[in-house]
């Protein structure tokens, strides 16, 4: 089970998957790059059936996801953490 | 033990309409995106579309999303394919499948497939 | 649609053997591939999900690999009981597409 676990540290992922999440399931992701306490990049996704998964950075297919979101914000000024909704 | 069990199956003349079901039991059939799937004699396996537990969302394959409707009743924990306009080429075993949301993604519980026979 | 083309029909093989199918996809589907058993009679089993995780049950001589357009699903040491269709899916778009199967014999 893929948890996400708000405690004392601010690392908030304690496991991570890879595993492909069709963008129909997916609500919204959260991106929080490494800084503030934790020393990794942690990708938070949540799924329109209302669970929450980490997601390893490294996972290609969530690395394409970013990259779309990375094009539809660069006209905006860039902010430490972001969420953006998954049409 | 996760059981989908089909039903509704048949002989069903050219232009006819037939409704399959698909009764859900040891899941919580409401929380699950399902599917139908079919496969023709001698050929491959063909999806033919999906609905969200709400049923907000169905999706269709775009070649038969005007003769067939997916529906659930989830108070019943059944699904089901209203067929329309049928043709011979709609003669297959239709099966339904859970879409699985939570771990894997794809289609992990089939039913046992029921059989419709296009034939005048 | 996405097109999912697995380069052989029929495969024949000997327990023991490893033998390996292929499924190329006409687009870039990323890791949203699963692969399928079907038996003569039975309903499809899911083997492999995200190209290349073992579903829960299933025996480790099957693997999965690949990503994007090209996909590989191996049995390493074929038993008596692996004689089957087996078919690639991709789940990563609407419509979903399934390959057209290759069915597995024994020699």
């Known amino acids: 089970v893929l948890e996400v676990y708000y405690t004392h540290l601010r690392c908030r992922c304690v496991q991570e998957s890879s595993v492909f999440i069709p963008r129909r399931f997916i609500d919204r992701i959260q991106i929080s790059p490494r800084g503030n306490g934790c020393p990794r990049k942690e990708i938070i996704v949540w799924k329109k059936n209302k669970s929450v998964v980490c997601v390893d950075p490294q996972a290609e297919w969530i690395q394409r996801i970013m990259e779309m979101l990375r094009k539809k914000s660069s006209s905006t000024p860039p902010v430490p953490v972001f969420k953006r909704k998954i049409p | 033990e996760v059981k989908l069990l089909q039903s509704g199956g048949g002989l069903v003349q050219p232009g006819g309409s037939l409704k399959l079901s698909c009764a859900a039991s040891g899941i919580d059939f409401s929380r699950y995106w399902m599917s139908w799937v079919r496969r023709a004699p001698g050929k491959g396996l063909e999806w033919i579309g999906e609905?969200?537990?709400?049923?907000?969302?169905?999706n269709y394959a775009p070649s038969l999303k005007d003769k067939f409707i997916i529906s659930r009743d989830n108070a019943k924990n059944t699904l089901y394919l209203q067929m329309s306009k049928v043709r011979s080429e709609d003669t297959a075993l239709y099966y339904c499948?859970?879409?699985?949301?939570?771990?894997?993604?794809?289609?992990?519980?089939w039913g046992q497939g029921t059989s419709v026979t296009v034939s005048s | 649609d996405i097109v999912m083309t697995q380069s052989h029909k029929f495969m024949s093989t000997s327990v023991g053997d490893r033998v390996s199918i292929t499924c190329k996809a006409s687009q870039d589907v990323s890791t949203g591939v699963a692969w399928y058993q079907q038996k003569p009679g039975q309903s499809p089993k899911l083997l492999i999900y995200?190209?290349?995780y073992r579903y829960t049950g299933v025996p480790d001589r099957f693997t999965g690999s690949g990503s994007r357009t090209d996909f590989t699903f191996t049995i390493s040491s074929v038993q008596t009981e692996d004689p089957a269709v087996y078919y690639c899916?991709?789940?990563?778009?609407?419509?979903?597409?399934f390959g057209a199967g290759t069915e597995l014999e024994l020699k």
């Open positions: 499948a859970r879409q699985d949301d939570y771990d894997y993604y794809a289609m992990d519980y």
């Open positions: 995200s190209a290349s």
């Open positions: 609905i969200n537990p709400d049923s907000s969302t169905i």
């Open positions: 899916h991709q789940y990563y778009t609407i419509p979903l597409t």
